[in-house]
């Protein structure tokens, strides 16, 4: 056979679907690897072929499209399961070819079991909503294309295991779920169960979104350095251990990159000859405000080390801050860094 452009196993698309539910999986070739769409390819005389490798097997085999009730079928560039079974888990390959051209890609498909409370190994998308803001809507995800617009499915929303009925600030509105003035207590997993008829059968789609209530942009500030500060003096004798924490508060800012670093006499710790250890820890508030602590330590401090200028720096998308630590040698009245 002719050479085939093999894109390998596309692990970026770790597709997970629930057992005993319909699943429609588009061939990734047209979404991520090729410049043209399925219609163009088809009209050019190219054929799309599907095959798979079962879990824990090496043998590629064709997909059986002759199962009862057309349980597995192909429509254009979509592979359909109506519904999935647990043993459909495996690596699926779609190949586009004619006599002179061939391109293929494989992707993993995992069929996941869930319990009656929707607990499973499924990875859920996270929707962040700002605390106390007016109205936030989440939409039942990934249900497009399962039924025609003429079909009006029934939709039931749950928080955890509890159907959302008379929740004070959470209102189900068909495919949408509205949150009014959200609070941290609204955090959790929200599941929509969409039920629709097809060819005399009822199918269910289960989709879960993790809601995380985060700090409001109205509260967003530049970094606030709690430590070091002007009230604490690090007074040490040569030979003692010097430990200075740099503790910085970052209010939550969507997609902000929060940074903390030390400079010693204006240089990064890696660029000085001092034997410095820096350990970092991070903690988060209920609204994902971040407190980042970088502890600078020198095991056996020298008189020279006690004359250096230790400055904690912090940066986020709102601005920068810096604060020098007051370091002095015991018995030495000077709190300012000495210049020889």
């Amino acid at each position: 056979s002719e050479r085939c452009d093999d894109w390998g196993l596309d692990t970026m698309r770790q597709i997970q679907v629930f057992e005993d539910e319909p699943a429609r999986i588009k061939c990734p070739l047209f979404e991520h690897f090729l410049k043209y769409n399925y219609s163009t390819a088809h009209s050019s005389g190219l054929t799309l072929i599907w095959y798979w490798t079962r879990q824990d097997r090496d043998l590629e085999e064709p997909i059986n499209f002759r199962l009862p009730e057309n349980r597995i079928s192909k429509e254009k560039d979509v592979l359909w399961f109506r519904p999935t079974l647990l043993n459909d888990t495996g690596n699926y390959t779609c190949m586009l070819r004619n006599t002179t051209y061939c391109s293929k890609v494989a992707f993993p498909l995992e069929v996941v079991q869930k319990d009656s409370c929707f607990n499973s190994a499924m990875r859920f998308p996270v929707h962040k909503m700002y605390i106390e803001h007016g109205i936030h809507k989440i939409t039942c995800p990934n249900v497009d294309g399962y039924f025609p617009s003429s079909v009006k499915p029934s939709v039931t929303w749950y928080k955890g295991c509890t159907e959302i009925v008379d929740f004070h600030n959470v209102l189900p509105e068909g495919m949408n779920l509205s949150f009014f003035i959200p609070l941290v207590s609204n955090n959790g997993n929200y599941t929509c169960v969409v039920t629709y008829p097809e060819n005399g059968r009822l199918f269910h789609l289960t989709r879960t979104v993790t809601v995380k209530v985060v700090g409001s942009p109205k509260d967003a500030l530049p970094p606030q350095i709690y430590s070091p500060n002007d009230r604490v003096v690090y007074e040490k004798e040569p030979g003692e251990e010097l430990v200075i924490p740099c503790k910085v508060y970052f209010s939550f800012i969507m997609d902000s990159h929060n940074e903390v670093w030390w400079t010693i006499d204006g240089k990064k710790p890696d660029d000085v000859t001092v034997d410095i250890t820096i350990n970092e820890s991070v903690s988060y508030s209920s609204t994902e405000d971040e407190t980042r602590t970088q502890i600078l330590s020198i095991k056996k401090v020298t008189p020279e080390d006690l004359r250096r200028n230790y400055v904690c720096h912090a940066r986020n998308t709102k601005g920068e801050a810096e604060q020098a630590a007051k370091v002095k040698q015991k018995g030495n009245g000077c709190t300012e860094p000495m210049t020889l």
């Epitope: 605390i131 106390e132 803001h133 007016g134 109205i135 004070h168 600030n169 009014f180 003035i181 609070l183 941290v184 207590s185 109205k218 209920s286």
Partner: antibody, heavy 118, light 107 residues
């Protein structure tokens, strides 16, 4: 200094309407969600309604849902409570209050008395 | 909705003595609990938020503790101006709800 000043209270017959106002000063009004809390004579405090900083999100106690409407005008630094289909049990002092999730109702107005009686 | 229950309904204390007020929530409210003081003819005043943080300008003799469902407001040494009604309030879940109040009166 944060100040909240309610007005619009008075005597009204059952089934009647009243509109309360709360004029705010001393803080950046559009940055804060606000609420109404009432207190019937000799009784405890009852949360009535809340509104988000932008006015889009509103919430109501079950006892007033469908009858009361909370709104705000950020250009005038004013909070409103439109009260329709008033009942005798709505008789109370109505307080407007500023709130944050972090600090609850941190500032209150002095209150305005609403009396529903025939 | 979350029901807040305060005890006792009335507390008789002598000036200079310690007063301990209790508040119980029907389900966990984490640390999202506030305490208010109200004197006759006045609006409520915020004393404590976050179960234990004193509001601006509140004297150190007022302290709050607890989390989850059990909360306490302690007034270490009652002053004459502290005789009032005290309310707890949860702001963890909508609707925000208040306790029925504890009246602290002079013994």
């Amino acid at each position: 200094e944060v100040q909240l000043l309610e007005s619009g209270g008075g005597l009204v017959q059952p089934g009647g309407s009243l509109r309360l106002s709360c004029a705010a000063s001393g803080f950046t009004f559009p940055d804060y969600p606000l609420g109404w809390v009432r207190q019937a004579p000799g009784k405890g405090l009852e949360w009535v309604s809340a509104i988000s900083y932008d006015g889009e999100g509103t919430l109501y106690a079950d006892s007033v849902k469908g009858r009361f409407t909370i709104s705000r005008d950020n250009s005038k630094n004013t909070l409103y409570l439109q009260m329709n289909s008033l009942r005798a049990e709505d008789t109370a002092v109505y307080y407007c209050a500023r709130f944050r999730y972090y600090t609850a109702f941190d500032y209150w107005g002095q209150g305005t008395l609403v009396t529903v009686s025939s | 909705e979350i029901v807040m229950t305060q005890s006792p309904a009335t507390l008789s204390v002598s000036p200079g003595e310690r007063a301990t007020l209790s508040c119980r929530a029907s389900q966990s409210v984490s640390s999202n609990l506030a305490w208010y003081q109200q004197k006759p003819g006045q609006a409520p005043r915020l004393l404590i938020y976050g179960a234990s943080t004193r509001a601006t300008g509140i004297p150190a003799r007022f302290s709050g503790s607890g989390s989850g469902t059990e909360f306490t407001l302690t007034i270490s040494s009652l002053q004459s101006e502290d005789f009032a009604v005290y309310y707890c309030q949860q702001y963890n879940n909508w609707p925000w709800t208040f306790g029925q109040g504890t009246k602290v009166e002079i013994k």
